[in-house]
């Protein structure tokens, strides 16, 4: 539950446990930037290491407009997307999404959102007299979580000091959404 997002009707779905976003289309609309923001941690040991610092996540930045009904944000927001795989920093491939490339009997790692931020967005609506705004919940950083073989997704293990603390400020996201809301998500998404 802690990893679910508060409902943001016309924004991208923030991944839940077991859900991992595809990276945005390559350079579509020239809006994808900083492709390996968090991929440069120094390596130390072979990939079997259990040292947290050995595992690196890729944070992809891209900008988009927020749509809501017939309204659109006056300015684009910059979103961060966590790419699908994690692994020892020195072994990270240059390209994203090549699949598993460490020992299959070892632990499975996922790159998922760590912290979120809320951004207030002014909406431009057709003819509406009231100044309208919404808050979109955006990923602020990513981290690796370990899933050992034969464990289900609910037993993902946290790395880092926040793991033992209850996660304040994580908002539950409803499971199903209206078709129009989902359609709006796809419009102006990237």
């Amino acid at each position: 539950q802690g990893w679910q997002a508060f409902k943001n009707d016309a924004t991208e779905i923030i991944p839940e446990l077991g859900e991992y976003p595809e990276p945005p289309p390559e350079l579509e609309n020239n809006k994808t930037m900083n492709r390996a923001e968090n991929g440069g941690r120094p390596p130390h040991h072979p990939f079997e290491t259990k040292d947290v610092s050995e595992y690196s996540c890729r944070e992809l930045h891209f900008t988009r407009y927020v749509t809501d009904g017939q309204c659109r944000s006056a300015k684009p927001v910059t979103e961060l997307v966590c790419s699908g795989q994690c692994g020892p920093a020195r072994l990270l491939p240059n390209a994203i999404g090549r699949g598993k490339w460490w020992r299959p009997s070892g632990p499975d790692f996922r790159c998922i959102p760590d912290r979120y931020r809320a951004q207030r967005v002014q909406l431009l609506c057709p003819g509406g007299a009231a100044p309208r705004a919404r808050k979109v919940r955006l990923v602020a950083s990513c981290k690796c979580k370990r899933l050992t073989r034969f464990h289900n997704q609910s037993e993902l293990k946290d790395f880092g000091p926040e793991a033992a603390r209850p996660q304040k400020g994580r908002k539950p996201r409803p499971r199903a959404r209206g078709a129009k809301a989902n359609q709006a998500e796809l419009e102006n998404a990237y």
Epitope: D68, C125, G127, A129, A130, R132, A133, G169, K171
Partner: antibody
């Protein structure tokens, strides 16, 4: 689970003020907008205003301008609505409601009955 | 202020019936309309927003339509838990205003 828990019922005299609290859990207060809506006994719903707890921005219905104050204590994720110069027609159930927009109300508190009587 | 007029103010229906409630705005509000359900002694619950977008967790028998000044809430097959009062609300122009409500009662 998103929850909004409001303070208990109040009985006030005309001319007095009332301050209703709304404690939120399951999310961070500053990530949303807080609205206040009231409902007189047997009547419909009436929007009073909204606030943005993150920056303290507020928008009040003109009917309540000058009499209502909406505030928040972000350290406790609690919102407050104070209504002053109470009159008998202010007798109503007062609801806090929250959401990610300024124009619809996604989650509601259970309501606080405020009775104004001499 | 924009006036929201609901009709009928009350109606009697049976389980399985198709129920339609209308809401008219005194001036155009585009599609900035929401519908809420309220049961006695309880807080309202959001059903539909942007005139036709179903809120998550709300059964698909509820649907909304309309734009501009005329809007409709339809319950395709009334269930026992649907007996309640329904309100429309415009979110286009401050102050946001609600309709007077439609009470759906058991026939």
């Amino acid at each position: 689970q998103v929850q909004l828990v409001q303070s208990g019922a109040e009985v006030k005299k005309p001319g007095a003020s009332v301050k209703v609290s709304c404690k939120v859990s399951g999310y961070t207060l500053t990530h949303t907008f807080m609205h206040w809506v009231r409902q007189a006994p047997g009547k419909g719903l009436e929007w009073m205003g909204w606030s943005d707890p993150e920056i303290g921005d507020t928008e009040y219905a003109s009917k309540f301008q000058g009499r209502v104050t909406m505030t928040e204590d972000t350290s406790t994720d609690t919102a407050y609505m104070e209504l002053s110069s109470l009159r008998s027609e202010d007798t109503a159930v007062y609801y806090c409601a929250t959401g990610d927009t300024t124009y619809k109300f996604d989650y509601w508190g259970q309501g606080t009955l405020v009775t104004v009587s001499s | 202020d924009i006036q929201m007029t609901q009709s009928p103010s009350s109606l009697s229906a049976s389980v399985g019936d198709r129920v339609t409630i209308t809401c008219r705005a005194s001036e155009g509000i585009h599609d900035a309309l929401a519908w809420y359900q309220q049961k006695p002694g309880k807080a309202p619950k959001l059903l539909i927003y942007w005139a036709s977008t179903l809120e998550s967790g709300v059964p698909s028998r509820f649907s909304g339509s309309g734009s501009g000044t005329d809007f409709t809430l339809t319950i395709s097959s009334l269930q026992p838990e649907d007996f309640a009062t329904y309100y429309c609300q415009q979110g286009d122009t401050l102050p946001y205003t609600f309709g007077g409500g439609t009470k759906v009662e058991i026939k």
